[in-house]
């Protein structure tokens, strides 16, 4: 999906309203200096193409984000604010849904929702310096 | 079962204010929009606004801006429409309706309709 | 954001097909592929009957079909039944600050 023609301002508004405190609640107990963030962006629809990846996308050892709080509203936030994002995403629902309810919360997940503040950091730092 | 039950007729005088209640039940309501549609009389239908209480996000049409509000209580599965300075040409049924989840433009579970009369 | 334009009016025999159709603009439904359409029986609400253009919700009849072309929605209804008789209305989406603009309504009878 291209990010381009998203409305990154009000992105930023649930992001800094909701988004943020449920990203803080999963790594609560985690120091910032626990993880190295790796992963970078450089643009705003960069940079929630790289969110979109790690929220979404399973991974060998973190399978299970996608259930989590802040990515059913991350998930509501791009489908009200990206035109045409969730056309892109049924499938991604779907498997969503049928995803296990287990709740272990891995050493590995903390580390890529760790990932995701940064991006997110970033996103909104790559914003102010438009304005 | 699923639906969307709405609150009774309302009389309301010019310049005063309505307040249509809507409350979900079976399923989750936090997860869908809950959109507001109107209807006058003989009329066609009028997209008014939408709640997405899962992120708090509330649009409204052009229209209406500063003269609708849209809330919602998660904890009773309600949702609320207010509209304010109304006028004769506000007399409508007031529907709220579903959004799909993450495509909350399509309204697939509808209440039944809300006959709001203002008149002097 | 002005009304999409929908005939007044349609009809047809029990048993033909009849296509109602519903115009817009590149910023509504030639911009996006997210129409809908709603069936209304007199004094009821509203019934979803197709969305994302031409996908058809569980419970819908598979004699209703939609499909567009440019900035143009059709509604087709083959083999008309005496309870299709009703109003339909077209719905786009027409951007992030405009969820649903409607058409005026087509009163579809079977003759």
């Known amino acids: 999906y291209d990010f381009t023609n998203c409305d990154f301002q009000k992105i930023e508004a649930d992001y800094l309203r909701t988004i943020s405190k449920d990203l803080i609640t999963y790594m609560s107990g985690t120091k910032s200096t626990d993880f190295n963030n790796t992963v970078s962006c450089s643009n705003r629809p960069h940079c929630l193409t790289e969110i979109q990846s790690l929220t979404f996308n399973p991974t060998p050892r973190c399978a299970s984000l996608a259930k989590e709080m802040f990515a059913r509203k991350t998930k509501a936030t791009l489908a009200l604010w990206c035109p045409g994002y969730s056309e892109t995403q049924i499938n991604a629902t779907q498997a969503m849904k049928k995803a296990r309810k287990s709740k272990v919360t891995t050493n590995k997940c903390l580390e890529q929702v760790s990932q995701l503040l940064g991006l997110w950091r970033r996103f909104i730092r790559t914003l102010l310096k438009k304005q | 079962q699923v639906q969307l039950v709405q609150s009774g007729a309302e009389v309301k005088k010019p310049g005063s204010s309505v307040k249509v209640s809507c409350k979900a039940s079976g399923f989750t309501f936090g997860s869908y929009g809950i959109n507001w549609v109107r209807q006058a009389p003989g009329q066609g239908l009028e997209w008014l606004g939408v709640i997405v209480p899962l992120v708090g996000v509330t649009i409204y049409a052009e229209k209406f801006q500063g003269r609708v509000t849209i809330t919602a209580d998660t904890s009773t599965s309600t949702a609320y429409m207010e509209l304010s300075s109304l006028r004769s040409e506000d007399t409508a049924v007031y529907y709220c309706a579903r959004g799909q989840e993450y495509f909350y433009w399509y309204f697939d579970l509808w209440g039944q309709g809300t006959l709001v009369t203002v008149s002097s | 954001q002005s009304a999409l334009t929908q005939p007044p009016s349609a009809s047809g025999s029990p048993g033909q097909s009849v296509t109602i159709s519903c115009t817009g603009t590149t910023s509504d439904i030639g911009g996006y592929n997210r129409v809908s359409w709603y069936q209304q029986h007199p004094g009821k609400a509203p019934k979803l009957m197709i969305y994302?253009?031409?996908k058809r919700p569980s419970g819908v009849p598979d004699r209703f079909s939609g499909s567009k072309s440019g900035n143009t929605a059709s509604l087709t209804v083959s083999g008309l039944q005496a309870e299709d008789e009703a109003d339909y209305y077209c719905s786009s989406y027409a951007g992030t600050d405009t969820f649903a603009i409607f058409g005026g309504g087509t009163k579809l009878t079977v003759l």
């Open positions: 994302e253009v031409s």
